[in-house]
């Protein structure tokens, strides 16, 4: 056959989908690699077909659309399978042609179970609630497309294994699921389970998010540098190890860079001729609150070195601050000897 | 199905002590406020106290009638809610109920179990 | 503490007939979110309280439609469009707004 235009295997499109569930997989070339949708292409006389690659096969083969009760099926740019089976795992291949052009890509698509309680391999989406906020709301997610609005499906909402009736704060509204206040508590898994009737069929959709609860805008401060600080004096001698530990608290702030950096003199330590290594450990808190530290490490300090401006840095979305290190060289204790020799000769 | 059972109750001399407890089952105990409320014989209802999950700080608060007195405890891993009663008087006579929620109000209650105190 | 006020304390209604309940506040129950933290219970004669009305006005699961919640801020009302016999017992107020949570006194319907 004449060459065909190759995206390859679009891993980025890893689809997992329940088994013994209904699946619509839209053709990736559209909503990825062509500057066109469906529609155009279907206008101007160019066909769309679907083959695909079992698991642990080589061999690629045409997708059977003639099963019972037409399982396996295409309209426009979407391939349906209702339902899914465990043995539809595989790479699936939607390739666009006429005469005269071709273009192809495939994407791994993974049938997965799931136990009485939800768990599965599936990767879950996380959903980030303001801790003590407002109402804040989760919505099944990925349902569009499988019923027509005509149709009223049945939803009931699960946190991890149970049943959510309005328990604490949270209450289910349809295809939303309701915190009137976030607390802590509502970390985890939430499932919704939209039942709908199709062709004299009932059908299960079965999505799971990841609620995490964080820290409220609210209570956003900027970062916070606990250290360095006026009550530590850093005081060497020559030779000895200068460790500076910069620790500073971040608020947390949705989709904010947290930066620390060192300036010594003013400039970045790579821009001064020392041996400066920086080691830098982040932990966060469970509202997802964040402390950065970053030891600043000068092995063998010399006295030009104890005479220099160490400065930590912190900058987020919310502002940037900066504190300086006291660093001093340590003055030689005077000798015993000769203090007391001054002594006598005193009296 | 979500399932509370009372026990523990029972006649106690003023004074005396008494622990009751709370069998939870049917959802995620740990993540869940609990509260007791009691009833006098013939009486409105009368909040006791409540515990927050351990998630959400433990913190624990009581009416003014029992502090002091009364202490509510929680064993997640048991599913079980207590109520440890001292220094008993007869006017904490009443039936007891450990119920789950506080914002949206108790949704679920237990059966209740009866406390008498009385020389 | 939030004092609960109901009335009437009784209330005799003939089955068929509509029914209504008044819980007042002391504060207003309005919470910084913007609901109402109000809830109605019904105790039935040796039964544990039963939840009807959350939120002022959200219907718990199982609970008739012929029930519902009004109101907002420190004046309530819990409705019964049509009474029926099964509907006998004490209805009661309570606030979640703040600790302690208080009920009021309680409503006690009986069939006439």
């Known amino acids: 056959s004449e060459r065909c235009d190759d995206w390859g295997l679009d891993t980025m499109r890893q689809i997992q989908v329940f088994e013994d569930e209904p699946a619509r997989i839209k053709c990736p070339l559209f909503e990825h690699f062509l500057k066109f949708n469906y529609s155009t292409a279907h206008s101007a006389g160019l066909t769309l077909i679907w083959y695909w690659t079992r698991q642990d096969r080589d061999l690629e083969e045409p997708i059977n659309f003639r099963l019972p009760e037409n399982r396996i099926s295409k309209e426009k740019d979407v391939l349906w399978f209702r339902p899914t089976l465990l043995n539809d795992t595989g790479n699936y291949t939607c390739m666009l042609r006429n005469t005269t052009y071709c273009s192809k890509v495939a994407f791994p698509l993974e049938v997965v179970q799931k136990d009485s309680c939800f768990n599965s391999p599936m990767k879950l989406p996380v959903h980030k609630l303001y801790i003590e906020y407002g109402i804040q709301r989760i919505t099944c997610p990925n349902v569009d497309g499988y019923f027509p609005s005509s149709v009223k499906p049945t939803i009931t909402w699960y946190m991890g294994c149970y049943k959510i009736q309005n328990f604490n704060n949270v209450i289910p509204e349809g295809m939303n699921l309701s915190f009137l206040i976030a607390f802590i508590s509502n970390n985890g898994n939430y499932t919704c389970v939209v039942t709908y009737p199709e062709n004299g069929r009932t059908f299960h959709l079965t999505r799971t998010l990841t609620v995490k609860v964080v820290g409220s805008p609210k209570n956003a401060v900027p970062p916070v540098i606990h250290s360095p600080n006026d009550h530590v004096v850093y005081e060497k001698e020559p030779g000895e190890e200068l460790l500076i530990p910069c620790t500073v608290y971040f608020s947390f702030l949705m989709d904010s860079r947290n930066e620390v950096w060192w300036t010594i003199d003013g400039k970045k330590p790579d821009d001064i001729p020392i041996d400066v290594t920086i080691n830098e450990s982040i932990s966060h808190s469970r509202t997802e609150d964040e402390t950065r530290t970053q030891i600043l490490s000068i092995k063998k300090v010399t006295s030009e070195d104890l005479k220099r401006s160490y400065v930590c840095h912190a900058r987020s979305a919310k502002g940037e601050v900066a504190k300086a290190a006291t660093v001093k060289q340590k003055v030689p204790a005077p000798r015993y000897t000769v203090e007391l020799a001054c002594g006598f000769g005193a009296t | 199905e979500v399932q509370l059972v009372d026990s523990g109750g029972g006649l106690v001399k003023p004074g005396g002590s008494l622990r009751l407890s709370c069998a939870a089952t049917g959802f995620t105990f740990s993540n869940v406020w609990m509260s007791w409320v009691r009833q006098g014989s013939g009486k409105g209802l009368e909040w006791v106290g409540r515990?927050?999950?351990?998630?959400?700080?433990?913190?624990?608060d009581y009416a003014a009638p029992v502090k002091g007195r009364f202490t509510i405890s929680r064993d997640d891993p048991k599913n079980t809610l207590y109520l440890q009663m001292n220094s008993l008087k007869t006017e904490d006579t009443a039936v007891y109920y450990c119920?789950?929620?506080?914002?949206?109000?108790?949704?679920?209650w237990g059966q209740g179990t009866l406390v008498t105190v009385s020389s | 503490d939030i004092v609960m006020t109901q009335s009437p304390l009784s209330l005799p209604v003939t089955p068929g007939e509509p029914a209504s309940i008044s819980c007042r506040s002391g504060q207003s129950l309005l919470h910084n979110n913007g609901f109402n933290c109000l809830a109605w219970y019904l105790q039935k004669p040796g039964q544990s309280p039963q939840l009807l009305i959350y939120?002022?006005?959200n219907r718990a699961s199982g609970v008739p439609d012929r029930f519902s919640g009004s109101g907002s801020g420190t004046d309530f009302t819990l409705k019964i469009s049509r009474v029926e016999a099964e509907d006998v017992g004490v209805f009661y107020c309570m606030q979640t707004l703040q600790t302690p949570i208080t009920f009021g006194q309680g409503t006690r319907l009986e069939i006439k």
């Open positions: 119920t789950t929620g506080e914002l949206l109000g108790f949704d679920y």
């Open positions: 515990i927050k999950s351990k998630t959400d700080g433990g913190t624990i």
């Open positions: 939120l002022g006005s």
